[in-house]
Interface confidence: low
């Protein structure tokens, strides 16, 4: 299994082609520092899947593992936060999926709702080899206490094997856990030995026990869920920033983006670009390029300002400041107008025009 690390240099190669990226909807994955995180790339069994973080290819490291369509980050740190992309290279074209990863203390214990590492959990048994239930992946069960902010999604897993294949049921505080016991019910992925509860509320607090049994025996494991009440919000961007700007060819310009966020935000500057003469792909999504993103050596103050030196006509267009945290994503946009040089440099700041 090859391993990849998270490289923190955040500058895109100039020759890298623009990609389509739907700003409003990248999946957001969250983890607490020290936890493991698994991201699923729905491009699936492509011949070659390459991964990038903030536009930079991921390099080898023993904390990050690529297994098929999954990127696993072990012992996550805040520096692992960022915009991840998986790209499937095909003979004719390529396709890319984007994910926001946020490593912060205030998060859900679970990963995404459709955990699909069932291949390692499903143990095929010889029909003659009878066996009582047993745990197949105790690593996924080590964290017994889960403190989760209200409204987050929680997943508890009890990967098991046995012959015949055991069944799984769940108890809450020692009693049968029924769908009607909570608003919205819950979801069980038997194939992956998981219980999923979305939008948890304080009444979901308690002990959750998986009971795995077949005719030769029974095993169980208990998790404790604590629901932490808070009023989360996605990043707030200061109104009017970034502001539209105009400058002459050869001049310098800067865009400023002020971000306010309780949860650790990840900030990026994105340029709307053209591909084959079009600003939008066939599915109506804009072509975008990540110009600047927070990295190891970048302070919050530095990332909040985008400098463009020695401006050319190609620099004209729409620029977007995008900020995401574990709660969601916000973005404001501004336009840069580039004027012919009249003989001396001139910089004008126009009225704000931003999206939200």
């Amino acid at each position: 299994r090859p391993s990849f690390s998270l490289v923190e240099d955040t500058t895109l190669e100039p020759e890298e082609p623009p990609t389509k990226y739907q700003i409003s909807q990248p999946e957001v994955y969250v983890a607490a520092p020290g936890e493991s995180l698994e991201v699923r790339c729905l491009l699936k069994d492509a011949a070659v899947i390459s991964w990038t973080k903030d536009g930079v290819h991921l390099g080898p490291n023993n904390r990050t593992v690529l297994i098929g369509e999954y990127l696993q980050i072990k012992g996550a740190t805040p520096r692992d936060s960022g915009l991840y992309a998986c790209t499937a290279s095909r003979t004719v074209d390529s396709e890319t999926w984007y994910f926001m990863v946020n490593v912060t203390d205030a998060i859900s214990s679970g990963d995404d709702e459709d955990d699909t590492d069932g291949a390692e959990d499903f143990v095929s048994e010889n029909s003659n080899n009878k066996r009582a239930p047993y745990w197949t992946n105790t690593e996924k069960m080590e964290k017994r206490l889960h403190a989760v902010p209200a409204a987050n999604t929680v997943k508890f897993r009890c990967p098991a094997g046995g012959n015949p294949m055991p069944t799984m049921r769940w108890l809450k505080n020692g009693k049968e856990f029924k769908q009607e016991h909570r608003i919205g019910g819950y979801k069980v992925r038997n194939q992956h030995w998981s219980l999923i509860m979305e939008s948890v509320v304080p009444s979901d607090k308690g002990n959750y026990t998986c009971v795995v049994e077949n005719e030769y025996g029974s095993i169980n494991h208990t998790y404790h869920l604590d629901v932490v009440e808070r009023s989360p919000h996605r990043p707030i961007l200061q109104a009017g920033l970034p502001a539209n700007a105009s400058t002459v060819v050869g001049g310098d310009v800067e865009f400023v983006c002020k971000v306010y966020s309780d949860a650790q935000p990840h900030i990026q500057w994105i340029k709307h670009v053209e591909k084959n003469g079009s600003k939008y792909g066939p599915d109506g999504l804009p072509y975008l390029k990540v110009l600047k993103a927070a990295g190891v050596n970048t302070t919050d103050k530095e990332i909040e300002v985008l400098y463009i030196r020695n401006v050319t006509f190609e620099d004209a267009g729409e620029y977007t400041c995008l900020a995401g945290n574990s709660i969601g994503i916000s973005f404001h946009s501004a336009w840069l107008t580039v004027l012919p040089a009249p003989g001396r440099e001139k910089e004008i700041t126009a009225s704000p025009d931003y999206l939200e």
């Epitope: 389509k20 957001v28 699936k44 499937a88 396709e95 919205g184 709660i327």
Partner: antibody, heavy 120, light 106 residues
Framework: MVQLQQSGPGLVKPSQTLSLTCAIS??????????WNWIRQSPGRGLEWLGR?????????DYAVSVKSRITINPDTSKNQFSLQLNSVTPEDTAVYYC??????????WGQGTLVTVSS | ELTQPPSVSVAPGQTARISCSGD??????ASWYQQKPGQAPVLVIY???DRPSGIPERFSGSNSGNTATLTISGTQAEDEADYYC???????????FGGGTKLTVL
């Protein structure tokens, strides 16, 4: 157990607006991991996804290109339901309309379906 | 665009296979739905090959290359229905369905 209950008129006149509602029980329209979809089925077109609404710290909508200019899907958190509005209908819009919940990328719960006929 | 055969026939107890083809479909996840007359579709396979709880083990799925396949082993009379495959477009914005296959149990 999640259940989706559809309601709305079965007959709409051409050029008017088709309006349907889908009431949710056993789940929340403001769920942070589900999406709420409208799908229609007609003999000529088969199953056709029309659009969805979903909440991820704010509300989002996606619509199929074929109806994008005419469709609106709105959530109603107070009643835990969501609605479909399709403007300027023609006989081509005659179909059985379904609401469905999706846990990307599949539709795991469906409403009972409503036959909507567009005719004068 | 997902393409399915309009009809498939199978004798009781035999294996029925319904195909669904689309450009590079194997690069995406396929789902399958069963629909009986006058009823809403029911999810029988998701993520290519996973079965929701309550769906009999005789239903299985696979997906590679340009073709996803729904396999019903030991087909029973109650399996007679229309079957639809479904997948998604780039970045999941649009969902697409196959045209449907009528399964007849002889």
């Amino acid at each position: 157990m999640v259940q989706l209950q559809q309601s709305g008129p079965g007959l709409v006149k051409p050029s008017q607006t088709l309006s349907l509602t889908c009431a949710i029980s056993g789940d929340s329209v403001s769920s942070n991991s589900a999406a709420w979809n409208w799908i229609r089925q007609s003999p000529g077109r088969g199953l056709e996804w029309l659009g969805r609404t979903y909440y991820r710290s704010k509300w989002y909508n996606d619509y199929a290109v074929s109806v994008k200019s005419r469709i609106t899907i709105n959530p109603d958190t107070s009643k835990n339901q969501f609605s479909l509005q399709l403007n300027s209908v023609t006989p081509e819009d005659t179909a059985v309309y379904y609401c469905a919940r999706s846990y990307y990328p599949d539709f795991d719960y469906w409403g009972q379906g409503t036959l909507v006929t567009v005719s004068s | 665009e997902l393409t399915q055969p309009p009809s498939v026939s199978v004798a009781p107890g035999q294996t029925a296979r319904i195909s669904c083809s689309g450009d590079a479909l194997g690069d995406k996840y396929a789902s399958w739905y069963q629909q009986k007359p006058g009823q809403a579709p029911v999810l029988v396979i998701y993520d290519d090959s996973d079965r929701p709880s309550g769906i009999p083990e005789r239903f299985s799925g696979s997906n590679s290359g340009n073709t996803a396949t729904l396999t019903i082993s030991g087909t029973q009379a109650e399996d007679e229905a229309d079957y639809y495959c479904q997948s998604y477009a780039s970045q999941g914005i649009h969902y697409v369905f196959g045209g449907g296959t009528k399964l007849t149990v002889l």
